[in-house]
């Protein structure tokens, strides 16, 4: 799916209509880029408790085990994106797979990552006729990590 | 940093002119989203051994040490991606920080991430004066994640 | 118009630290998209990329010997530098400085566009 | 790594033949660059992006291929085109620049 701009344009760029209207099929194809989750959201169920799985996907298994949670946004590009939301303050004991060991604990791993907004373009708002994207940073929790606490200096 | 687009386009969308030529400075302003991984990268020589440390961030505190590695694509947005590289087969313990626990695996959690490439459009490679924005999913490592090895039923 | 120029000593021996500089003009390394390589031939024998800096100061280098190498820009003179340590007779070549950073319509090349002439080292006790 | 294999590493043509030289990678790339050069000289672009001409390079010049193939065409060669010539790619990662082993044309 692309998106088709023409050279030098003064927002980068500037664009013309070639029939009255897209249809939302058009910009939703574009926009929907990626609907899963690093791991496949028909395992999660595994992974909804405090316990590391010895089966199922990454984030069952890890023991600092995590569930994915969607956030969906139809002006957004990508449309979906999903937050990883821990399931133990404490990373579960290797041996066992559900006692917690306080030596460890399991945090959240945040990324940054770029995404395009559709917006109305800047003093155009009565138009109805251009959209722009707009680029931002947009905060997300990627995984559940297990690290050692932080011994302040 | 905004994309103009003009509503009801044929490719999603077709785009005009404004001035003769676009300066590098404007398409790498668009594209150079985001250019940290999602730890920073002036802590990273503290990950480059296989052993959890007691200070710095993630990716060193994190019993499955990573490092992370530049993919740099000036054609592409994110024109900066980072992938997460393992620096032990298996977790580290909890209690020391440097030996090695045959229990667990350290693996890496990979995700395909929308990006878009900066391309002639299709059938116009002569014009010189568009180019297409082309989305893709692009497979990147985003941390490693210390895991109970599989069993298989 | 764009010029690049390699200096650096002709003879070394083994063990020693090579430094070679490539002085150039016609256009600025702190242009957004700009990047400056080093490559080099050894007699008869093909082309080697070693290293590469970028306008924003990232640098790459070839893996196989990324210990042994060091790239840096001083944007102000125009130059980069490259340091080669430890070298030793394989790494007699001629080394060639290269810029890469032409936008076309469709997005950045990632050829070189501009080379010098090369300077020819020989590493031999 | 991405190795790219150039095909033959010597060739030798007359005046007037239609050469084509093949560069393949190890794995599949974007777009390819060709370089031709002389004994004594640094290399001089001939092909941008697997087809696009360098600037001052006859049309007798041309580049096609896509995926691991890819392919240098001389349509008649003239007596300035004896040289060698090399395919070179770019992997965004880890960023790494590749050349071809070169191919040597020779006057037959």
């Known amino acids: 799916v692309s998106l088709r701009i023409q050279e030098g344009c003064s927002h980068l760029p500037s664009c013309c209509p070639s029939k009255e209207q897209e249809p939302p099929e058009e910009w939703l194809k574009w926009s929907s880029a990626s609907v899963s989750p690093p791991e496949p959201l028909s395992h999660t169920h595994h992974a909804e408790s405090c316990r590391a799985s010895k089966d199922g996907p990454l984030n069952s298994r890890a023991i600092s085990p995590w569930s994915y949670e969607l956030d969906r946004d139809l002006n957004r590009v990508p449309q979906d994106l999903y937050h990883a939301r821990c399931l133990c303050p404490h990373c579960v004991s290797l041996q066992t797979g559900s006692h917690m060991d306080p030596l460890g604990n399991s945090v959240p791993l945040y990324h940054n990552q770029t995404v395009f907004y559709r917006r109305p373009c800047h003093g155009e708002e009565g138009t109805h006729r251009r959209y722009c994207l707009e680029r931002r940073l947009y905060r997300v929790s990627l995984a559940c990590v297990c690290v050692r606490p932080r011994v302040m200096a | 940093v905004s994309l103009r687009i003009q509503e009801g386009c044929s490719h999603l969308p077709s785009c005009c002119p404004s001035k003769e030529q676009e300066p590098p400075e404007e398409w790498l302003k668009w594209s150079s989203a985001s250019v940290s991984p999602p730890e920073p990268l002036s802590h990273t020589h503290h990950a480059e051994s296989c052993r959890a440390s007691k200070d710095g961030p993630l990716n060193s505190r994190a019993i499955s040490p990573w490092s992370y590695e530049l993919d740099r694509d000036l054609n592409r947005v994110p024109q900066d991606l980072y992938h997460a590289r393992c620096l032990c087969p298996h977790c580290v313990s909890l209690q020391t920080g440097s030996h090695m626990d045959p229990l667990g695996n350290s693996v890496p959690l990979y995700h395909n991430q929308t990006v878009f490439y900066r391309r002639p459009c299709h059938g116009e490679e002569g014009t010189h004066r568009r180019y297409c924005l082309e989305r893709r999913l692009y497979r990147v490592s985003l941390a490693c994640v210390c895991v109970r090895p599989r069993v298989m039923a | 118009q764009v010029t690049l120029r390699e200096s650096g000593p002709a003879l070394l021996k083994p063990t020693q630290t090579l430094t070679l500089t490539c002085t150039f003009s016609g256009f600025s390394l702190s242009t957004s998209g700009m990047g400056l390589g080093w490559i080099r031939q050894p007699p008869g024998k093909a082309l080697e990329w070693l290293a590469h800096i970028w306008w924003d100061d990232v640098k790459h280098y070839k893996p196989a010997l990324k210990s042994r190498l060091t790239i840096s820009k001083d944007t102000s003179k125009n130059q980069v530098v490259l340091t080669i340590t430890n070298v030793d007779p394989v790494d007699t070549a001629t080394y060639y400085c290269?810029?890469?950073?032409?936008?076309?319509?469709?997005?950045?090349?990632?050829?070189?566009?501009?080379w010098g002439q090369g300077t020819l080292v020989t590493v031999s006790s | 790594d991405i190795q790219l294999t150039q095909s033959p590493s010597f060739l030798s043509a007359s005046v007037g033949d239609r050469v084509t030289i093949t560069c393949s990678a190890s794995s599949s790339v974007s777009y390819m660059y060709w370089y031709q050069q002389k004994p004594g000289k640094a290399p001089k672009p001939l092909i941008y992006r697997t087809s696009n001409l360098a600037s001052g390079v006859p049309s007798r010049f041309s580049g096609s291929g896509s995926g691991t193939e890819y392919t240098l065409t001389i349509s008649s060669m003239q007596p300035e085109d004896f040289a060698t010539y090399y395919c070179q790619l770019y992997h965004s990662y880890p960023p790494t620049w590749t050349f071809g082993q070169g191919t040597k044309l020779e006057i037959k």
């Open positions: 290269a810029r890469m950073g032409q936008l076309h319509y469709y997005g950045y090349d990632y050829a070189m566009d501009y």
